[in-house]
């Protein structure tokens, strides 16, 4: 099987959503957890994560082979405390398989704005709000 993990972000007004998306087969979901860590380069685990989510076991329809499970971590107002390095990870509690997404960062500037860097270019993201930018 092949399990794929991606990171993305979206902005709604002053809110910033950090999103971990895992694509997987139905039969691969059992015992899998996706989680988001901050400033944890080596010991990112569900226990040390900001948020965790069990993978979907049902895509809701029967005519598909793959399911996407999405963990969303919402920051209502980005502050200097949110600056840091983030990573989406997934782990199987059954098989011990561990997946690590790319690191991405939130940088809070002295002007009161912030940028999110390190996200994959293939994720098309547009901010309608000028408080934040993605690169």
């Amino acid at each position: 099987g092949c399990i794929n993990i991606t990171s993305s972000a979206s902005q709604e007004g002053t809110r910033l959503n950090l999103i971990c998306t895992v694509w997987h087969k139905k039969e691969e979901a059992e015992g899998f957890v996706v989680f988001l860590c901050k400033d944890r380069s080596g010991d990112c685990s569900p226990e040390t994560s900001l948020k965790q989510l069990r993978l979907k076991r049902d895509p809701g329809i029967d005519g598909v082979g793959e399911i996407s499970s999405q963990l969303m971590f919402t920051i209502s107002q980005v502050t200097p405390l949110h600056s840091g390095t983030y990573q989406c990870c997934a782990r199987s509690q059954k098989s011990g398989i561990r997946l690590q997404g790319h690191f991405f960062s939130i940088l809070f500037t002295e002007t009161g704005n912030y940028t999110v860097t390190g996200l994959k270019q293939r994720q098309h993201l547009e901010f309608s709000h000028n408080e934040g930018t993605l690169s």
Epitope: R54, K56, D58, P59, G60, D62, G63, S69
Partner: antibody, heavy 121, light 107 residues
Framework: QVQLVQSGAEVKKPGASVKVSCKAS????????MQWIRQAPGQGLEWIGA????????RVTQKFRGRATLTADKSTSTAYMELSSLRSEDTAVYYC??????????????WGQGTTLTVSS | EIVLTQSPATLSLSPGERATLSCRAS??????LHWYQQKPGQAPRLLIK???QSISGIPARFSGSGSGTDFTLTISSLEPEDFAVYFC?????????FGGGTKVEIK
């Protein structure tokens, strides 16, 4: 045992909004898709949408997009369906139903008792 | 979206007779079709899952068949409590859809 208990009947004026609740018990709420279906008087069943409480993934059929909002509260195992800009044609019985385990049941194996919505000026 | 067409709209039969209800999908849905029974004032009840699989607690006189686009619900010998409306529903793709229903009434 699995139970879905819906909120009581509602009477609303055209243009108003309504929020119907569906409290689930007897199973792991976050592991199953919750469906919303309606039935106008003397008519068939019409699927509105579904939500997966585990990650709040929601699907709403085109006809109701922009008017129907599906949410779920994990802490109380309650699903909600909010319908806005009500019109007389929205007068119907609204059901919540659980989709059974994929490839094992797949159909809607448990249903709420229904919530009657009357839209009238 | 997948359109499900049920026929006939009404079926007039006597107790003890065999009822054959049809559901046709606008495109192939494999066996991703389910049948429900609904009585007046009640919520629907799942009768058959995945076209032909039985449901615990549902009498053996109810059976389903078909795959692809053509499906059939058969009630081998109608009991008085079987007179109701029957709906098919597909779970193959979004949006999920129901057929328009077949009413089985007493002749």
């Amino acid at each position: 045992q699995v139970q879905l208990v819906q909120s009581g009947a509602e009477v609303k004026k055209p243009g108003a909004s309504v929020k119907v609740s569906c409290k689930a018990s007897g199973y792991t709420f976050t592991d199953f898709w919750m469906q919303w279906i309606r039935q106008a008087p003397g008519q068939g069943l019409e699927w509105i949408g579904a939500i997966y409480p585990g990650d709040d993934d929601a699907r709403v059929t085109q006809k109701f997009r922009g008017r129907a909002t599906l949410t779920a509260d994990k802490s109380t195992s309650t699903a909600y369906m909010e319908l806005s800009s009500l019109r007389s044609e929205d007068t119907a019985v609204y059901y919540c139903a659980r989709r059974g385990i994929a490839a094992v049941v797949g159909g809607f194996d448990y249903w709420g008792q229904g919530t009657t919505l009357t839209v009238s000026s | 979206e997948i359109v499900l067409t049920q026929s006939p709209a009404t079926l007039s039969l006597s107790p003890g007779e065999r009822a054959t209800l049809s559901c046709r999908a606008s495109q192939s849905i494999s066996n991703h079709l389910h049948w429900y029974q609904q009585k007046p004032g009640q919520a629907p009840r799942l009768l058959i899952k995945y076209a032909s699989q039985s449901i615990s607690g549902i009498p053996a006189r109810f059976s389903g068949s078909g795959s692809g686009t053509d499906f059939t619900l058969t009630i081998s010998s109608l009991e008085p409590e079987d007179f109701a409306v029957y709906f098919c529903q597909q779970s193959n793709s979004w949006p999920l859809t129901f057929g328009g229903g077949t009413k089985v009434e007493i002749k």
